[in-house]
Interface confidence: low
Amino acid sequence: ASVGLPSVSLDLPRLSIQKDILTIKANTTLQITCRGQRDLDWLWPNNQSGSEQRVEVTECSDGLFCKTLTIPKVIGNDTGAYKCFYRETDLASVIYVYVQDYRSPFIASVSDQHGVVYITENKNKTVVIPCLGSISNLNVSLCARYPEKRFVPDGNRISWDSKKGFTIPSYMISYAGMVFCEAKINDESYQSIMYIVVVVGYRIYDVVLSPSHGIELSVGEKLVLNCTARTELNVGIDFNWEYPSSKHQHKKLVNRDLKTQSGSEMKKFLSTLTIDGVTRSDQGLYTCAASSGLMTKKNSTFVRVHEKPFVAFGSGMESLVEATVGERVRIPAKYLGYPPPEIKWYKNGIPLESNHTIKAGHVLTIMEVSERDTGNYTVILTNPISKEKQSHVVSLVVYVPPQIGEKSLISPVDSYQYGTTQTLTCTVYAIPPPHHIHWYWQLEEECANEPSQAVSVTNPYPCEEWRSVEDFQGGNKIEVNKNQFALIEGKNKTVSTLVIQAANVSALYKCEAVNKVGRGERVISFHVTRGPEITLQPDMQPTEQESVSLWCTADRSTFENLTWYKLGPQPLPIHVGELPTPVCKNLDTLWKLNATMFSNSTNDILIMELKNASLQDQGDYVCLAQDRKTKKRHCVVRQLTVLERVAPTITGNLENQTTSIGESIEVSCTASGNPPPQIMWFKDNETLVEDSGIVLKDGNRNLTIRRVRKEDEGLYTCQACSVLGCAKVEAFFIIEGAQEKTNLE
């Protein structure tokens, strides 16, 4: 038989025995001559090196490039392939020789002791036990022990081949400690050598690279990549690395087994690739492949090598971030850089520290953004090696959906006397300011609940048919004033006012404000009454501990049964089918109050006195009167606010000052408190008395000293006092210059 491809110029070596297989008896002589066209060599079984004393290779006497192989007294072990080949080529001729030795039908291995077969428990894998035969057509079985089992060829997955050995699915003998082949010749049994069975694993669970991603270095730095393979037990692993600059001088590979906990069902192998000083050519994909023979798993990572440390902002870095109050805001610091920069955030120049409301890291996170978060945020990136800095400013604009100030008045609004002019107000705070504030209205009776409609606390008016205020037919004559802008509580607010020129009919009014992030609305109950009238005596808001009287006056000829009620702090749920306003129709929520009746010639006056008013007395007071003829009830509501007592405070400080003789000094002392405090001035702890040069104005708030003299120098004190105590501020006035001499001197 010929092996290899024929060369153009060389013919295959020619053997003296022109057969693929030669069968000879033991103890005979084997002789084969090989002729060719250049130098030849022989290879034979059990000694591939070419030095065996029994085997003789001689040059032929009759020609160049000819060699004869002779083995006298062949034995079974000489069975195998005999190859004649041209040196340094793969051109060869082969003959397979069987030496039939019925006493030793199996070819013994070189060691002649025992062999080893490695198997895996994989169902699909077969193993070959290399019990080769010196006779081609033997009846061979495989014996495994312990326990003893015999396997015979089945024409399928179990077979024996004299040139190869015994083939069997590996799982069938994985239990065994040893196996051997057995041949039966004329009722005699012949055994091959013993083969120890070693079960090896093959499963690789995973291959993990560390670091796994985002590996960045600068030229000259050391790269260390760890590749860990986790496998089942009894596995041997070969690692293979692929990387950009394979011919690296400073590359080092170390492979080792890692210890695992006793009783662990897995093994760990580690391969470490180290490059001491990376160059730009080391940038690229690094792949670690772990192979167990039957299985290969690999993992890759990209290594980026920078010329030098650097830092820069990424193109996606925002300059303007818009958010709505209450939202979570995330501003990521998008950067390119090596090594990763230190990141510091500032707001309007002040460093930001992380707390429960704000997280200042790679991403600036404001958990629940509020108006005060509006501003310029500066992020500064610092390269930890080069100390290079880059900064970027992000403007955060926090939008506020329209909030209507008066909406916080949760109680029903007062009733309005028939025929009067009234102004309704919506004070809107929004960022950006509202695009528009629109007013709508509808008749009170049109807004009565259908029995099927429940009224919610948030929307007590189940009204749908709102009409534009331009269309006031059937309602009150209305005029919407141009929006005003006012600074209220330090905020720019938009004030929209609606003027009802004559309160003729009860209606509901709605103001609706819209800006780019939302809308807000307020529904105002405008209940018109021809009935009783409420007045407050004295006609001002009372302060705690002061007394106040609520007077309800009604025409005696029209009304009777005047009664005072107070609206409960938390009205009872409104029942289906009932109207939330006017309160007259729902007396369940009212508390009856004691009052005193007075009369004059035309009116009944029901007076309800509150002595020593307290904050608990605040609320909505209802006067109910009944029409003498129709018995219809008429209600009037008046909201009473009781001012809290507040100890005096002085806003602002008096400043020490130096003034020249003859000039004027003007200082002011603004005090607040409830009841309003009295202001007094002292000079050097003596009460300051007004004269031609010392003027006190605006309830002593403003002090003017005209044409100051040297004797005006001293410690001035402003003191504000009420029943709740005093507050004071002091300043020293220095008077410079010489006093002009008067003519009298």
């Epitope: 950006p432 695009h435 528009h436 749908e464 609706e512 819209v514 800006n515 780019k516 992030v517 939302g518 809308r519």
Partner: antibody, heavy 120, light 109 residues
Framework: QLQLQESGPGLVKPSETLSLTCTVS??????????WGWIRQPPGKGLEWIGT???????YYNPSLKSRVTISVDTSKNQFSLKLSSVTAADTAVYYC????????????WGQGTLVTVSS | EIVLTQSPGTLSLSPGERATLSCRAS???????LAWYQQKPGQAPRLLIY???NRATGIPDRFSGSGSGTDFTLTISRLEPEDFAVYYC??????????FGGGTKVEIK
């Protein structure tokens, strides 16, 4: 991804009422931060705003069309509709529905438009 | 109503050139409420700029907007072949109606 799709007859007779529906998918018409508008464009001409609606039913109309326009919303079907009465040939146009970021604000998502021809 | 006048009506330029489109309002418009759109034949308008100078999502940075009061400008720094289209400005001020400009057609020279 938010999508808007106009539907309705492509041909309407003069003096009749033009009716179109816009179906919103990939988002809710009940969003409190979005308004929904109709815009039209006569062939070869510019854009004209018709009107806008909020999910609650509040409407804002172009004063020049106010007497003839009705825009309504059906939150259960995620749709809003346009009715334009007493049409004439001058109402022939491509009608677009769009999302307004808020009332009288920019239109950021548009339908592909539907051509309505007014002809007898 | 606020009338928006766009100029020029047609702008003939070559790819790579800079385009400057003007939008003038008949009365002052808050800069928060001016937008620009691009429209190609057979397509719906596409939002480019809102609040005078803010690019909408996905709009390349060659498009920029500026202006205040009554004068507003859309600039395309370097025209790409896909930029040839009709451009509309739109105001969304405090009083109805919302109005669009008459449009500027940017065509290939």
């Amino acid at each position: 991804q938010l999508q808007l799709q106009e539907s309705g007859p492509g041909l309407v007779k003069p003096s009749e009422t033009l009716s179109l529906t816009c179906t919103v998918s990939g988002g809710s018409i009940s969003s409190r931060s979005d308004y929904w508008g109709w815009i039209r464009q006569p062939p070869g001409k510019g854009l004209e705003w018709i009107g806008t609606i909020y999910y609650s039913g509040d409407t804002y109309y172009n004063p020049s069309l106010k007497s003839r326009v009705t825009i309504s919303v059906d939150t259960s079907k995620n749709q809003f509709s346009l009715k334009l009465s007493s049409v004439t040939a001058a109402d022939t146009a491509v009608y677009y529905c769009a999302r307004q970021q808020l009332v009288l604000y920019y239109f950021d998502y548009w339908g592909q438009g539907t051509l309505v021809t007014v002809s007898s | 109503e606020i009338v928006l006048t766009q100029s020029p009506g047609t702008l003939s330029l070559s790819p790579g050139e800079r385009a400057t489109l003007s939008c003038r309002a008949s009365q002052s418009v808050s800069s928060s409420y001016l937008a620009w759109y691009q429209q190609k034949p057979g397509q719906a308008p596409r939002l480019l700029i809102y609040a005078t100078s803010n690019r909408a999502t996905g709009i390349p940075d060659r498009f920029s907007g500026s202006g205040s009061g009554t004068d507003f400008t859309l600039t395309i720094s370097r025209l790409e072949p896909e930029d040839f289209a009709v451009y509309y400005c739109q105001q969304h001020g405090s009083s109805p109606p919302l109005t669009f400009g008459g449009g500027t057609k940017v065509e290939i020279k």
